[in-house]
């Protein structure tokens, strides 16, 4: 297992609709054809898996059905979008990238993106 550098923004604020997007960029040492991207969430000393996708270079990322993640890839960059977030989902979201094929296997883990989620205020009663 060889180490690889992964960069991601330090802070992102989710939209009022609970959507957060950020770029995960990895310094590929070789010509990987198969890449696996996993998003982890660290909160309250627990690390949980948010979503994961394996893709072939040049192809779209495919997440599982009912995943809260979507994404696109461009070269060594992965554009990740997480939907349906609520205030309780605030936390550090870590991008983990694995170069699966061809060998050698490379692993890179970013420092994490702190995603802040603020639940929208309920609309006041209106006469209109």
């Amino acid at each position: 297992c060889k180490a690889m550098h992964v960069a991601q923004p330090a802070v992102v604020l989710a939209s009022s609709r609970g959507i957060a997007s950020f770029v995960c960029e990895y310094a590929s040492p070789g010509k990987a054809t198969e890449v696996r991207v996993t998003v982890l969430r660290q909160a309250d000393s627990q690390v949980t898996e948010v979503c994961a996708a394996t893709y072939m270079m040049g192809n779209e990322l495919t997440f599982l059905d009912d995943s809260i993640c979507t994404g696109t890839s461009s070269g060594n960059q992965v554009n990740l979008t997480i939907q349906g977030l609520r205030a309780m989902d605030t936390g550090l979201y870590i991008c983990k990238v694995e170069l699966m094929y061809p060998p050698p296997y490379y692993l890179g883990i970013g420092n994490g993106t702190q995603i802040y989620v603020i639940d929208p205020e309920p609309c006041p009663d209106s006469d209109f």
Partner: antibody, heavy 123, light 106 residues
Framework: QVQLKESGPGLVAPSQSLSITCTVS????????VYWVRQPPGKGLEWLGV???????NYNSALMSRLSISKDNSKSQVFLKMSSLQTDDTAMYYC?????????????????WGQGTSVIVSS | QNVLTQSPAIMPASPGEKVTMTCSAT?????MSWYQQKSGSSPRLLIY???NLASGVPVRFSGSGSGTSYSLTISRMEAEDAATYYC?????????FGAGTKLELK
């Protein structure tokens, strides 16, 4: 159809380690998480840990130092290892299929369970 | 951790009777599951995502609730429903189960 089957040693001596294998069929380990739950005789259910579709693990913090979960996707097998067993670890150990990740749009359930494997810790 | 308290612990009920058991959490929950376990058997999923009926489960079972208060209802008790019922939360790790409600045939 979906099936999970646990296989374990049955009897374990105190301070020894436990290894249980969960062999699954009817679904892929890359599309679902596998959750481990135990039940001491006459008592309730206790969640031990999970290995998610992506291969990341999460453990019950009370047991984290003694637990290890891994899997072999190609063999459709999930492995639970637990160290330093004591008599209060005597229980029925279950594996169950569940959500692939911790945060989903829907589908929060352990929908299929194995028949369980009985583990008795005794000298 | 999020502690789930089920009540009552033991509940006698007659065939045809409406049965409601509750599950109370120490902090707010988004999704709750309910499981049925009969003596000597593995748990069986009844309700997922708080109110959705699992495949093959009779429509007499229903789940509801929000925040910290959830319930499982059996509209008309049948003899085969005698079992222990567990609630389980998905909102925080570690995942936790309630201690169970034992439903007995009166």
């Amino acid at each position: 159809q979906v099936q999970l089957k646990e296989s374990g040693p049955g009897l374990v001596a105190p301070s020894q380690s436990l290894s249980i294998t969960c062999t699954v069929s009817g679904f892929s380990l890359t599309s679902y998480g596998v959750y481990w739950v135990r039940q001491p005789p006459g008592k309730g259910l206790e969640w031990l840990g999970v290995i998610w579709a992506g291969g990341t693990t999460n453990y019950n913090s009370a047991l984290m130092s003694r637990l290890s979960i891994s899997k072999d996707n190609s063999k459709s097998q999930v492995f639970l290892k637990m160290s330093s067993l004591q008599t209060d670890d005597t229980a029925m150990y279950y594996c169950a299929r569940g959500p692939p990740h911790a945060m989903m749009k829907r589908g929060y359930a352990m929908d299929y369970w194995g028949q369980g494997t009985s583990v008795i810790v005794s000298s | 951790q999020n502690v789930l308290t089920q009540s009552p612990a033991i509940m006698p009920a007659s065939p045809g009777e409406k049965v409601t058991m509750t599950c109370s959490a120490t902090s707010s929950i988004t999704y709750m599951s309910w499981y049925q376990q009969k003596s000597g058997s593995s748990p069986r999923l009844l309700i997922y995502d708080t109110s959705n009926l699992a495949s093959g489960v009779p429509v007499r079972f229903s789940g509801s609730g929000s925040g910290t208060s959830y319930s499982l209802t059996i509209s008309r008790m049948e003899a085969e429903d005698a079992a222990t019922y567990y609630c389980q939360q998905w909102s925080s790790y570690p995942l936790t189960f309630g201690a169970g409600t034992k439903l007995e045939l009166k």
